[in-house]
């Protein structure tokens, strides 16, 4: 099976790498614009220069292209706790990240929120916090893991998953109750 190419990819594949086919004259291959620039005018003829202009402030192109407009710079999302790691330049988009001791949680492919790394109170760090993953905690005896926090087994209801982890404690509590009724 031959992979289906879009019209633009079909047009570009006729020309050597770094060039694109003139939209009005398919016998002409124009040189693509460098990153940091965009296409202002197609080349007038073979061997003639493409008219490329530098992206204006607040916009960029990160690779060679024949775009009619530069791309708008991304903004870091304050409401998601994001901070700017590096600002937008003509050839690179803004890079957003999280503060120290925070990790990124991706709600979707292009949307992340910053959360504080778990400290594993009443437990130990099994895996350290990473850029895209929270700390993995192991809880001390008498505690169970709930939403990545070590919670006392006294908060374990019999219907919850914690009953397996807290079984000795639950039995003890039950035993104490029983001994009081004899």
């Amino acid at each position: 099976l031959v992979p289906h190419l879009g019209d633009r990819e079909k047009r570009d594949s006729v020309c050597p790498q770094g060039k694109y086919i003139h939209p009005q004259n398919n016998s002409i291959c124009c040189t693509k614009c460098h990153k940091g620039t965009y296409l202002y005018n197609d080349c007038p003829g073979p061997g003639q220069d493409t008219d490329c202009r530098e992206c204006e402030s607040g916009s960029f192109t990160a690779s060679e292209n024949h775009l009619r407009h530069c791309l708008s710079c991304s903004k870091c999302r304050k409401e998601m706790g994001q901070v700017e790691i590096s600002s937008c330049t003509v050839d690179r988009d803004t890079v957003c990240g999280c503060r120290k001791n925070q990790y990124r949680h991706y709600w979707s492919e292009n949307l992340f929120q910053c959360f504080n790394c778990s400290l594993c109170l009443n437990g130990t760090v099994h895996l350290s916090c990473q850029e895209k993953q929270n700390t993995v905690c192991t809880c001390h005896a008498g505690f169970f893991l709930r939403e990545n926090e070590c919670v006392s087994c006294s908060n374990c209801k019999k219907s919850l998953e914690c009953t397996k982890l807290c079984l000795p404690q639950i039995e003890n509590v039950k035993g104490t109750e029983d001994s009081g009724t004899t």
Partner: nanobody, 119 residues
Framework: EVQLLESGGGLVQPGGSLRLSCAAS????????MVWVRQAPGKGLEWVSH????????YYADSVKGRFTISRDNSKNTLYLQMNSLRAEDTAVYYC????????????WGQGTLVTVSS
């Protein structure tokens, strides 16, 4: 007690419009960024849109960009989602929620309102 109550869902034809509302109570609405998420039949939760405290910064999933508009009225403690050019794939239960703060889970969200797009 935090309460979020969605309304405005229903059956609509492809290309039609709906406006969802979410009435909030039990917390200071103006202090919280708010989210719309949806769950299509047999699928997981999908982040649709969110809005900051004052209604200035908004975000839209690529699947709804240019068709949906999120807004809020802090004087009425209400969140809105205007849905235009609806498609069959927009069929889902829509939930409003408070943007999570402590971890990647929704502590507070509503009971949902069903949107069905069908001819």
């Amino acid at each position: 007690e935090v309460q979020l109550l969605e309304s405005g869902g229903g059956l609509v034809q492809p290309g039609g419009s709906l406006r969802l509302s979410c009435a909030a109570s039990g917390f200071t609405f103006a202090h919280e960024p708010m989210v719309w998420v949806r769950q299509a039949p047999g699928k997981g939760l999908e982040w649709v849109s969110h809005i900051d405290r004052v209604g200035q910064d908004t975000y839209y999933a690529d699947s709804v960009k240019g068709r949906f508009t999120i807004s809020r009225d802090n004087s009425k403690n209400t969140l809105y989602l205007q849905m235009n050019s609806l498609r069959a794939e927009d069929t889902a239960v829509y939930y409003c929620a408070i943007l999570p703060k402590r971890g990647p889970r929704f502590d507070y969200w509503g009971q949902g309102t069903l949107v069905t797009v069908s001819s």
